[in-house]
């Protein structure tokens, strides 16, 4: 299993939207992609989960565009706020 986030950093003005890309490789048939936000304290905050058999996930300002064949799960954060400045991680799990 492998997860790749090619964007090392991204800068966007407040109130705009940003899309963070995540590509993965897996041999699992059924799996989940999780998006987390890392606080300055290094604490990881769960944001949203995309299931391999589920519709595109949406939760508040967070939405996922899932492309199953391309093995791509992009996180969009809309109406950006200053508090959104952070490091974001995607993770793969069964």
């Amino acid at each position: 299993q492998k997860v790749t986030q090619a964007q090392s950093s991204v800068s966007m003005p407040v109130r705009k939207a940003v899309t963070l890309n995540c590509l993965y490789e897996t041999s699992w048939w059924s799996y989940y992609i999780f998006w987390y936000k890392q606080l300055p304290s290094k604490e990881m905050i769960f944001l949203i989960r995309q299931g391999s058999d589920e519709q595109n996930a949406k939760s508040g300002r967070y939405s996922v565009n899932f492309k199953k064949a391309a093995k791509s799960v992009a996180l969009t954060i809309s109406a950006l706020q200053l508090e959104d400045s952070a490091k974001y991680f995607c993770a793969l799990g069964e």
Epitope: W29, S30, G51, S52, D53, E54, Q55, N56, N65, F66, K67, K68, A69, A70, K71, S72
Partner: antibody, heavy 117, light 106 residues
């Protein structure tokens, strides 16, 4: 209303190649993958492969590797499938279908390909 | 790959009759999807995530099942329901379709 307009029927000779097109409208072309499906009376519906128009990433059913090549053109919102070294086994109706996870939510009208000498 | 077997392959029903067709998977799948196809037309999305009806699908249709066994039911057959119905899974790669159940009106 999402539309997938496929190219017209093709009559081709054995051994030749053919390139089918699928023009998408009324949605952001790069936001979802385009899949291709083959339908015959014998084998029913079979997934051929898929392309992500945003990145060009493709995935193929092992059965169709070497037979089909998928491409897309973002500027015209069109997906293409080229079939090579055609035989009678390739005579079928071919559909493009837009994947909205987790299923094939929109389908083109189909293109009939007939391989005959 | 996961093989989907639909039964019966061909069936007929009278108007008003209850109709049930099944789809059996060779391995367990999370959800099943169903499409309706009429002659000289492309497949229409019909039921998604096992039991959710696509927009415009009459309420007399329902879907159910889990694991390796799924079904599509029409509570009261109508003439316009005559068509071929295909099940499809996307739990395993590649996505696969069943061979179809052709439903005719008596």
């Amino acid at each position: 209303q999402v539309q997938l307009q496929q190219s017209g029927a093709e009559l081709v000779r054995p051994g030749a190649s053919v390139k089918l097109s699928c023009k998408a409208s009324d949605y952001k072309f790069t936001d979802s993958e385009m899949y291709w499906v083959k339908q015959t009376p014998v084998h029913g519906l079979e997934w051929i492969g898929a392309i992500d128009p945003e990145t060009g990433i493709t995935a193929y059913n092992q059965r169709f590797k070497g037979k089909a090549t998928l491409t897309s053109d973002k500027s015209s919102s069109t997906a293409y499938m080229e079939l090579r070294s055609l035989t009678s086994e390739d005579s079928a109706v071919y559909y493009c279908t837009r994947a909205v996870p987790p299923w094939f939510a929109y389908w083109g009208q189909g293109t009939l390909v007939t391989v005959s000498a | 790959q996961i093989v989907l077997t639909q039964s019966p392959a061909l069936m007929s029903a009278s108007p008003g009759e209850k109709v049930t067709m099944t789809c059996s998977a060779s391995s367990s799948v999370s959800y099943m999807y169903w499409y309706q196809q009429k002659p000289r037309s492309s497949p229409k999305p019909w039921i998604y995530l096992t039991s959710n009806l696509a927009a415009g699908v009459p309420a007399r249709f329902s879907g159910s099942g889990s694991g390796t066994s799924y079904s599509l039911t029409i509570s009261s057959m109508e003439a316009e329901d005559a068509a071929t119905y295909y099940c499809q899974q996307w739990s395993g790669d590649p996505p696969t379709f069943g061979g179809g159940t052709k439903l005719e009106i008596k």
